[in-house]
Interface confidence: low
Amino acid sequence: KLTIESTPFNVAEGKEVLLLVHNLPQHLFGYSWYKGERVDGNRQIIGYVIGTQQATPGPAYSGREIIYPNASLLIQNIIQNDTGFYTLHVIKSDLVNEEATGQFRVYPELPKPSISSNNSKPVEDKDAVAFTCEPETQDATYLWWVNNQSLPVSPRLQLSNGNRTLTLFNVTRNDTASYKCETQNPVSARRSDSVILNVLYGPDAPTISPLNTSYRSGENLNLSCHAASNPPAQYSWFVNGTFQQSTQELFIPNITVNNSGSYTCQAHNSDTGLNRTTVTTITVYAEPPKPFITSNNSNPVEDEDAVALTCEPEIQNTTYLWWVNNQSLPVSPRLQLSNDNRTLTLLSVTRNDVGPYECGIQNELSVDHSDPVILNVLYGPDDPTISPSYTYYRPGVNLSLSCHAASNPPAQYSWLIDGNIQQHTQELFISNITEKNSGLYTCQANNSASGHSRTTVKTITVSAELPKPSISSNNSKPVEDKDAVAFTCEPEAQNTTYLWWVNGQSLPVSPRLQLSNGNRTLTLFNVTRNDARAYVCGIQNSVSANRSDPVTLDVLYGPDTPIISPPDSSYLSGANLNLSCHSASNPSPQYSWRINGIPQQHTQVLFIAKITPNNNGTYACFVSNLATGRNNSIVKSITVSASGTSPGLSAGA
């Protein structure tokens, strides 16, 4: 089928286009080109007769068209009006006609665009800016670039006017950037030069440097002021409200105490019309001041509060030193120094952190010490202790009990007998006691600052007869060769003799046995399994005597090196192998077996029926005592001989 291809389809003004003919029929008489979508003699461009090779211009011929023998049409120096359809009319030798239509579009070559702005000096947080891409061109697409990137998504950015206008609402200093616009059509793309948006802002609150505010007499004072601002701020200095100079830096040499005061920096932006000020108070010391310690917490609570001690005053280029209890600071994770050593922080104070604390300022020739500061750490009350420790008294004596609990502030004490309040004193005195004074004696200690209370209860027995004693132990299951055990004979009674028996015999002489606390306590060092005996204590006075029930010591030991039985190591094939493992241990151990290193069963007896030479190898018994945390093992080599051969001793058994 006859077709027309336009090369190119989109043509720039001034360029050329070729209307290329495809599938031109054979045996042609001639052909003719027309402007438009149909054959119209008034719109004929050119005709061509093949026999004469004669081209004849038509009414629509502009002098820019060239026809080729293959019927293709070249149009040069294209103008906007050339846009549209073109029809080829082919006349064959048999005078049968055939037509085909093609088309192309003409676009102007775009000029380099430029950006116009409605506000060349917008003010931050106040103005909007509208950029417009010039010129306005038909059939062109408009694009925008910020710092050579496509537009970010922002509610403050708005495109309008077919994307030709970019509006920035409420500009900020961050909108200071390079903006470009680009125009595009099918035949060209052009980008504008950059436009830099100059946002006026500030001044922000100025900062005065350096930050330190304490100086020594004779030093130079050199203060610098800076405020973020566009255009750059103009600076003025005021001392105690009086104008000094319009410079960014203020320099006063060889200052004296009279230079102490408030120093104000004022920053002014003439374009935004805004002023901002910052004030710093400068203190000039006549000589290195004696340091002093300030605390953020004068009454810290133990295990609750942290305390920050600060060495005052803050002075530039000064070394700060600290002492606790007249010693340099100990290394402790609870002590922290600030970067400049000026602040010492005690984390989670304890009653031992009272001090005294001193700080010092290092001068050229000496160190100036602060006065010592003592922390008043509130603590307690701890569990009160009632003394004396006796619990048994004879009738007719005086009962004098004293109570004490560590506490700051000092605890307030109350006494209760059998739950009934008696008196609010630290000491309780009852003369000429009788059996009726037996009972529960409670001391209550109260800390009014923390609101905490602690109590201790003591049972007092008043009796002419000594009670039956009992034995208390500090370790009910001691481990052999490791632990010590202390037996104590209860109760503690005045004017009483304490005696001990082991397995019904008086105590043997041994360096591992020790009596203390008026023979009331019997200590066995490095207990052994042989110490697992019956222990009895006795008490006696001039009136009576009594013995405790026996207490048997349960010593944990082992496991010892196990024994595998029977001792045989050579077996005949077909026999049953029945190995038993035993280890002395308290409590009984856990047993397990391994054959050639491979775990087997967790039993005391290992049984294998009808063994063969495949059962040769090392048989290991492992014992473990979970109470002592100890393990042990033994290894035995087993040799199985084939039936009918004499089992000799195997080497390496």
């Epitope: 481990v479 060769d481 490791k482 856990q590 397990s592 391994r594 775990p599 967790h602 290991a620 492992f622 473990s624 979970l626 002592t628 945390g629 100890r630 393990n631 093992s633």
Partner: nanobody
């Protein structure tokens, strides 16, 4: 991966000393017991020394008591066997073996280091 690497073995004259090291990786030895076990041709395997790092408990075979000392440095995750007054009968391959306190027998073994006592 749990690994035990013994080192320190070698040839020494009778009466001499050696210090064996057992470097552990893949676990913390402070929660374990460590044993030095020796194997010699023609002899039964023998547990010569044993230490439980969580109790400090130590134990020695009668044949090495007073001559060998077992210790452990939990910060270096390493166990040691200091062997003094060495005898010909101490010649063996020495293995370090680790068992946790709840374990049955030795859970992990090293590859062994050879000690030869000979004049």
């Amino acid at each position: 991966e749990v690994q035990l690497v013994e080192s320190g073995g070698g040839l020494v004259q009778p009466g001499g000393s050696l210090r064996l090291s057992c470097a552990a990786s893949g676990f913390n030895i402070k929660d374990t017991c460590i044993g030095w076990v020796r194997r010699a041709p023609g002899k039964e395997e023998e547990l010569v020394a044993y230490i439980c790092n969580y109790t400090g408990y130590t134990r020695y075979a009668d044949s090495v008591k007073g001559r060998f000392t077992i210790s452990a440095d939990t910060s270096k995750n390493t166990a040691y066997l200091q062997m003094n007054s060495l005898r010909a009968e101490d010649t063996a391959v020495y293995y370090c073996a680790i068992t946790s306190y709840h374990g049955q027998g030795y859970n992990y073994w090293g590859q062994g280091t050879t000690v030869t006592v000979s004049s």
